[in-house]
Interface confidence: medium
């Protein structure tokens, strides 16, 4: 039975040209995290594998930095980066947990972080 929950940074906003940290946290389970995938709508951004470390998708090598931790840093933001991002936690023995983050990239200098929320 899957008892864990994914806590994410929820709805966040950032300035064009700036950076943002995408962060998820798996709690309420003793399952072992074997891999975390980061996806943007229909594309893979990166993978963090417990044994092998990080794989950054070639399309994003110049703009994505691993970490902190299992999170992901997105750099040189453009308005086109606005949209949904997903953290997919592969765990043993529970299976797969998915968290969602919505990022809005703003032209102006007004960029506030949204509240944290949980996805069971």
């Amino acid at each position: 039975m899957m008892t864990g929950t994914i806590e994410t940074t929820g709805n966040i906003s950032a300035e064009k040209g700036g950076s943002i940290i995408l962060q998820c946290h798996l709690s309420s389970t003793t399952a072992q995290v074997t891999q975390v995938n980061w996806e943007q709508q229909d594309q893979l951004l990166a993978i963090c594998n417990a044994d092998l470390g990080w794989h950054i998708s070639p399309s994003f090598k110049d703009r994505v930095a691993p970490g902190p931790g299992l999170g992901l840093t997105l750099q040189s933001l453009t308005v086109n980066d606005t949209g949904e991002y997903f953290c997919i936690y592969h765990t043993y023995p529970d299976g797969t947990y998915t968290g969602r983050i919505f990022l809005e990239v703003l032209e102006s200098s007004v960029a506030e972080h949204g509240a944290r929320f949980q996805i069971p």
């Epitope: 891999q35 594309q43 044994d51 092998l52």
Partner: antibody
């Protein structure tokens, strides 16, 4: 355990398009665990990576073949495919489909020989 | 593009002997990104080692991998008749490349 099986014509004429399909069994092609790739091996020679696709549709190709290659995924059939256009005799090879963890290729099809000849 | 050079091209040994196969990269490769495969005639390659030193599922412990940076080694501690085959190293940097292979033949 994953099993992969290539299918498609064994003979293709020069300048035409080579088309192969890989059917995946023992697991879902929609798994975010895997990339789905193609590798080829000319007779008596070494291995050359062609490209891969992620289940969400993002692709990455060997730069030397990029202009001629298309890899697509059909999640409803648990298949992915390779198209290589404007083939020449140099494209004659055994073509393998394989699953990749992003770092290495862990499951392979048995391979299918494609000969380019008129 | 990272070029992998394997040596020797052919290695002639007898069953029971120790085999040492080398793979040298043209630039530094993360250990996580180095794998070894075995290929027998008419068969697909089979993953032996990943992450430079981790054995794949079902691979006997006589196979071991080591190395870092630009120099990697596959060692078969005591050759069995079924080990005679072609061995390839493979790396993942920004794209996948394979070495040209080492043929391990019976002496």
């Amino acid at each position: 355990q994953l099993q992969l099986q290539e299918s498609g014509p064994g003979l293709v004429k020069p300048s035409e398009t080579l088309s192969l399909t890989c059917t995946v069994s023992g697991g879902s092609i929609s798994s975010s665990r895997y990339f789905w790739g193609w590798i080829r091996q000319p007779p008596g020679k070494g291995l050359e990576w062609i490209g891969y696709i992620y289940y969400r549709g993002s692709t990455y190709y060997n730069p030397s073949l990029k202009s001629r290659v298309t890899i697509a995924v059909d999640t409803s059939k648990n298949q992915f495919s390779l198209k290589l256009s404007s083939v020449t005799a140099a494209d004659t090879a055994v073509y393998y489909c394989a699953s990749s963890s992003a770092w290495y290729f862990d499951y392979w099809g048995q391979g299918t020989l494609v000969t380019v000849s008129s | 593009e990272i070029v992998l050079t394997q040596s020797p091209g052919t290695l002639s040994l007898s069953p029971g002997e120790r085999a040492t196969l080398s793979c040298r990269a043209s630039q530094s490769v993360s250990s996580s990104y180095l794998a070894w495969y075995q290929q027998k005639p008419g068969q697909a390659p089979r993953l032996l080692i990943y992450g430079a030193s981790s054995r794949a599922t079902g691979i006997p412990d006589r196979f071991s991998g080591s190395g870092s940076g630009t120099d990697f080694t596959l060692t078969i501690s005591r050759l069995e008749p079924e080990d005679f085959a072609v061995y390839y190293c493979q790396q993942y940097g920004s794209l996948y490349t394979f070495g040209q292979g080492t043929k391990l033949e019976i002496k």
